[in-house]
Structures are given as C-alpha cells and as structure tokens.
C-alpha cells in the first residue's frame, strides 16, 4: 500500500484512516496514491507547513474531533485536486489568511463545531467552486462586507449557533445560487432591509432562536422558491401585511414562541402547500375575519398558550381542509356559534383551559367528522341540547374540571354522557360542582332528584340519539334503556375509531391536574 | 430499545379490505411523525403516506389516495394503515418508519420496522 | 412530483474500492436528500440526512454530497458489509420520493 503509517489503515483503493489519541502528528509516510484521508479522534494540536506535501491526489480530507488549535498558512499546499475539506470539531480560534490559498477544486469546507472568532473576506478569496461552507459552532460576532463576494456558486451556508448580533444588508448579496442559509441560535435583534434581496434560488432560511423584534415588510420578496422559513423562539411583536405575500412555495413555517400580538387579514399570502401552522407561545388577543383564508391546504393550526379572548365568525375562512384546530390555554369566553361553521374536516380540537362559560348550540353544526373535543378546564355549567348528537365519530371527548350545575336542567346531558361513557376516557370524570350538596359528585352517576328535591323534572326529549334516562322509579319504564347490549353497542362502533388520540399536555407543562384540566 | 414492529400483513383478494398497526417502543410516540413507505418484490422503495405527530396533518401519494387511510393512536403507541379497494400492485413488503425531522436541517426516516407482507391475489 | 434518478443502477466492485453512487432530480430541492443502505430481507438503513450529515452510529467512510439537484454518496473504501441497494429520497415536498436504487455487488 506504498507504505502505510502503523497508526493508520490504508485500503488498496487509495484510502487513509487514522484514529486514537496516541497520534499526536500527522502521521508519516502517507501513501502518495490516498485520494481519501480522515485523521479522527486524535491528539493533534496542530498542522505545521506542508504535511500533505506528498499526496497531491487527495480528494477529501477529514481532521475532524481532535485537539487542534493552530494552523499554519501552507497546511494544505499542493492539494489542488482537494474537493471536500472538514477541519469540524476542533479548537481552531484563528484562521490563517491563505490557508485554503491553491485548493482550487474545493466544493466543502466545513469548519463547524470549534472557536473561531472571526472571519474575513481574504479567508475565502480562493474558494471560488466552494458549494457548501458550514461555519456553525463557532464564536462569530460579525460577519464583515465581502466575507462571501467570492463564493458565487456556494449552495449552502450554515452560520447557526454563533454569537452573532448584527448582518450587514451587503453580506449575500453576492451569493445568488445560495439555497439553504442557517442563522439559527445566534443574537440578531433585527434584518436589515434588502439582507435576502440577492438571494433569488433560497430554498431554506433558518432565523429560530435569535432576538428578532421586527421584520422589515419586503424582507422576503425575492426568495419567491422559499420553501422552509423557520422564525420560531424570537422577540417578533407584529407581521407587516405583506411579510409573507410572495412566498408561494412555502411549505414550512414556525412562528411559535414569538410576542405576535395580533394577525392581520390575508397576512398569510397564497401558501398552497403549507400544511401545518405552529403559532403557539404568542401574544395574540384576537383573530380577525379571513385571517387565514389563504391557506387552502391548512391541516393543522395550532393556536395554542396565546392570549386569545376573541374569535371573529369568519376568522377560519378558508380552512376546509383543516383537520386539527388547537386553541387551548387561551382567555376565551364566548364562541360564535359559526366560528367553526368553515371546518368540514376537521377531527380534533382543542379547547381546554379557557374560560369559557357556555357554548352555542350550533358551535358544531356543520363539523360532522369531530373525533376528539377537548373542553376540560373552563368555566362551563352546561351544555346546549343536542350539541354532540351529529356527531358520529366522536370518540374523545374530555369534560372534567369544569363547575356543572346539577340541577335539572343537566339531565339531558347527563344522559348522553351516562350512554357515551367510553368517550369521556378513563383519567377524570366531570363532577358537580353546584349544588353544594352534590359538589365533588361525578356528574354521570349524581341523582338529580336529591341535588333538588324541589323541582319538578318535566318529562323532556333528551338529545335525539339516546333515551332520556331518569332516576326514580316514578317515570314509566319505557323512557329507560331496556338492556345493557342497548347502551354499549353504539359505543363499541367507536371505541376503534381512535384515529386522532390526543395526548394529555399537561406532563408536557409539569401542571397538575388542577391547574391545567 | 427504539422499535418498531409492524402486523396485520395477510393474503387478501382485490378489492379487499386490510389494516396494518405498527406498534412503537423505546422513544415518545407522540413527538414524532410517523410514515409508511411499502417495497414491491425485486423493486425499490415507494412512499405512500405520512402523519404528523398529533394525527392532524397526513399526506399520501397518489397511487394510494382515497383507498388509504393512515391513523395514529398516541396513548397506545401504534400507528395504522387501513387499505381498501386493494389491487394486485398493492402486493408489496409494508414498512412503517419514523420520521424524524428538525429546523436544522435533519430529515430522515431514522427508525424502521422489519416490514409485513401484503399479498392481493385472487 | 419530483422525480429522482440514480446512475449507476448497479455496479460490480472489490472490498477497498472507493464507490460512487450519483442521484439526480427533476427540480432543485436544496439538501433535503437523505441516503438509505438496505440489505436483503431488511429494512432500509438511514445512512446520510440534509445531503451531506452522516447519522449517528454510521462509519465514517460513508459521506455526501451535493445541493440542488446533484447529490452524491461516496463510500470511501468498500467493506464486506456495504455489499447492498442504495437509495436517495427527497423531503423538499411530497411526496417524498425515492430512487430507484443503486446496487452494489461483489466483483
């Protein structure tokens, strides 16, 4: 194998491992036909001049998690047929000017994951075919003018997890074929205007977990291929109307954990393939009418931990093909009753932990394929008759921590529930919390009769689909269910019908059940 | 550890019915979306569904779009493929996959299942 | 929906051999690539995500890359145990296509 190092293997196709801490330099003599070499997991601390003099084949070069430190500018001389170059995981804090001066045929440079401070313009001057440059990692504060001008071709470029406070509109202005652009987990507090202008090809910009306060209101119009924009776990208080009209690729969009205060109408411009929207951990108050009109796709919105008080009737325009509507820990009171009348697909929603004190009879109508209703938590005495009856699909519907009346105007519902027992789940059961005498009381099994011995129950149609089922044995035996078979059957039907099993949040927020329901 | 074991496979006559579970082990269910991708004999791989990790969000190609249905059940850990009008060329290896993507650019059907066979054949 | 096509469909080599496989597709996808390994009678492996980032737990000597609608998955020296199918699919947009496969067989 043209003389491998003993620390090393070397395979007959002219490649070259070297691993384990013993190696403290670049291991001699190396085969000059090696076309691959990767020096792992050593102690190496640093590359003096020219120690890959002799294989000049060499195509791609991996010094990757080892201890070093330093680099002299002529390392890599004589590697012009280099293509990939992975200097990751080390504890490289300064790059020598010139040190990838001659790697003419360079496509990946990757220098991820050490602790370099700074870059300059005269680092990557040579690096003209350069098509990847991954630079996440690092301890970057600024990125100067003219640091990329070279890179014409670079497809790729990952600046993530940096300490970067500020990006100069001029920096990308030159890398027009740039597709993916990760700024994820530094420090930006704003964009500049014109910063992505130059960037016709984006595909992907990844800006989570920065300091972002506003976006400038043309910031996105020229990346019309966008189809990733992550902006989740920022400072963001509002959205310019026309932030997001020109994204009509857009498939993927994380807004959650921002301070968004409130969603203007059509804010979200065609995005024919979006399918999910995350918008939870915001600060919106209300949502207006045709907010979302323009997400024909939409299968999932997630509304959640807001501050939602207000829903306008028209506010989910458009949505018919939304399947998933989570609005829970919001400060809802009051729903329109044809708030939902636009989702007819939908199978899920959730509504706990509002404050809401009754609901519409017709809040339902027209949403026949619900699976799951999730109104644990809210200041609910009762519920309209009839309101699930439409319902056939239900399978999870979750009552508890709410303060029922148990008077006799609950019968009907306590009723429904007593025959669609299985659908309430097994965890908690929604208990009486008015009258006192009965507080604390499971509402299926309560007697009403003793809650208030004092009124009259009239002999009332419960809700259509089953019987009314009364408590003494005054009332004619005909208005009970005859037999057990009777009472469980319809339920059977659902019980495998559990397509969308919406889990519990609250070991999610570490709430106990008394706080969250 | 991290498994996944997918059942239901079975000889069915075109235009039959058939569900498939895939039972999952070893990671949080609910946090991630979940795939089946089926193989043909002595062919490559087809993507044929995926659902997200509520069960809200589901996709799937054409070849299988409104025979198909794919389902979760979070509290029992399984995902589901039901398959309906069933047809010769649904003959294949069924493999449910997890599906584990990030905002930092990870995309990957990271866990897979050892596959049940589903023959349609009169 | 975007079509990937692999080159070679197959090929013949020797342990050591340093191997090549190419995957192409029909519109830019950015890196949204991943690579799978699958041996007979088994799953599908992931091997390599977003182009170029090699999985946890997979050797070293797999690597790719690429962006847009050119890919590549080296494997710098054949082991007896990289004898397989190798495929590329695309997560840019559904449906998340596959190749066709690349076989890798013993000379």
């Known amino acids: 194998y043209h003389g491998c190092p003993s620390e090393c293997t070397c395979s007959r196709a002219s490649q070259v491992e070297c691993t384990g801490a013993r190696i403290v330099a670049v291991p001699t003599p190396l085969p000059w036909n090696a076309m691959s070499l990767q020096i792992l997991n050593t102690h190496i601390t640093e590359l003096n001049e020219s120690p890959f003099l002799n294989i000049s084949a060499l195509i791609a070069l991996r010094i990757e998690k080892n201890e070093l430190s330093r680099i002299t500018p002529g390392a890599f001389r004589n590697l012009g047929s280099l293509r990939y170059l992975s200097l990751a995981n080390n504890k490289l804090q300064v790059l020598p000017i010139g040190l990838f001066q001659g790697l003419d045929s360079l496509e990946s440079l990757l220098l991820s994951s050490n602790q370099l401070l700074q870059i300059q313009p005269a680092h990557f001057s040579q690096c003209s075919n350069l098509k990847e440059l991954q630079l996440h990692g690092n301890h970057l504060e600024y990125i100067p003018d003219g640091a990329f001008d070279h890179l014409v071709g670079l497809t790729k470029l990952n600046l993530g997890k940096n300490s970067l406070t500020h990006i100069s509109p001029r920096v990308f202005q030159h890398l027009g074929n740039l597709q993916v652009l990760r700024l994820y987990e530094n420090r930006l507090t704003d964009i500049p205007m014109g910063t992505f202008d130059g960037l016709v090809n984006l595909q992907e910009l990844a800006l989570q977990q920065n300091q972002i306060g506003l976006l400038s209101p043309g910031l996105f119009h020229n990346n019309h291929n966008l189809q990733r924009l992550y902006l989740s776990n920022n400072h963001i208080s509002q959205l310019p109307p026309s932030v997001f009209m020109q994204l009509p690729q857009l498939n993927r969009l994380t807004l959650f954990g921002n301070s968004l205060k409130e969603l203007s109408p059509g804010i979200f411009g065609p995005m024919p393939n979006l399918r999910e929207l995350w918008l939870y951990d915001n600060h919106i108050s209300s949502l207006p009418d045709n907010v979302f009109s323009n997400l024909r796709q939409l299968q999932v919105l997630i509304l959640s931990r807001n501050q939602i008080s207000f829903i306008s009737p028209g506010a989910f325009n458009g949505l018919t093909e939304l399947r998933e509507l989570s609005l829970h820990t919001n400060a809802l009171q009051d729903l329109d009753g044809n708030v939902f009348r636009m989702l007819a697909n939908l199978q899920n929603i959730s509504l706990q932990n509002n404050r809401l004190r009754q609901l519409p009879g017709n809040i339902f109508a027209n949403v026949n394929g619900l699976m799951a209703i999730q109104l644990q938590n809210n200041q609910l005495e009762n519920l309209p008759l009839g309101i699930f009856d439409h319902l056939g699909k239900l399978c999870e519907l979750r009552l508890y921590d709410n303060p029922w009346r148990c008077d006799s105007d609950i019968l009907p519902l306590r009723n429904w529930l007593l025959l669609n027992q299985p659908r309430l789940g097994t965890d908690t059961v929604p208990v009486c919390f008015s009258p006192a005498n009965v507080r604390g009381q499971s509402l299926i099994i309560i007697n009403v009769n003793v809650a208030v011995p004092s009124v009259h129950v009239p002999e009332v149609p419960s809700y259509p689909e089953t019987p009314w089922y009364p408590d003494t044995p005054s009332y004619p035996d005909t208005t009970s269910v005859s037999s057990t078979t009777e009472l469980t059957s319809p339920v059977e039907d659902y019980t495998d019908l559990t397509t969308i099993q919406v889990t519990d949040d609250r070991s999610v927020w570490g709430m106990t059940q008394a706080q969250s329901g | 550890q991290v498994q996944l074991v997918e059942s239901g496979g079975d000889l069915v006559t075109p235009g039959g019915s058939l569900r498939l579970s895939c039972a999952a082990s070893?990671?949080?269910?609910?946090?991630?979306?979940m795939t089946w991708i089926r193989q043909a004999p002595g062919k490559g791989l087809e993507w044929i569904s995926d659902i997200g990790s509520s069960g809200g969000s589901v996709d799937y190609a054409d070849s299988v779009k409104g025979r198909f249905t794919i389902s979760r059940d979070n509290a029992k850990n399984s995902l589901y493929l039901q398959m309906s009008s069933l047809r010769a060329e649904d003959t294949a290896v069924y493999y449910c996959a997890r599906y584990n993507w990030n905002d930092r650019g990870y995309d990957g059907f990271d866990i897979w299942g050892q596959g049940t066979m589903v023959t349609v054949s009169s | 929906e975007i079509v990937l096509t692999q080159s070679p469909s197959s090929l013949s080599a020797s342990v050591g051999d340093r191997v090549t496989i190419k995957c192409r597709a029909s519109q830019g996808i950015s890196s949204a690539l991943a690579w799978y390994q699958q041996k007979p009678g088994k799953a599908p492996k992931l091997l390599i995500y977003d182009a170029s980032s090699l999985e946890s737990g997979v050797p070293s000597g797999f690597s790719g890359s690429g962006s847009g609608t050119d890919f590549t998955l080296t494997i710098s020296s054949l082991q007896p145990e990289d004898f397989a199918t190798y495929y590329c699919q695309q997560f840019n947009s559904y449906p998340h296509t596959f190749g066709p496969g690349t076989k890798v067989d013993i000379k």
């Open positions: 070893g990671f949080t269910f609910s946090d991630y979306y």
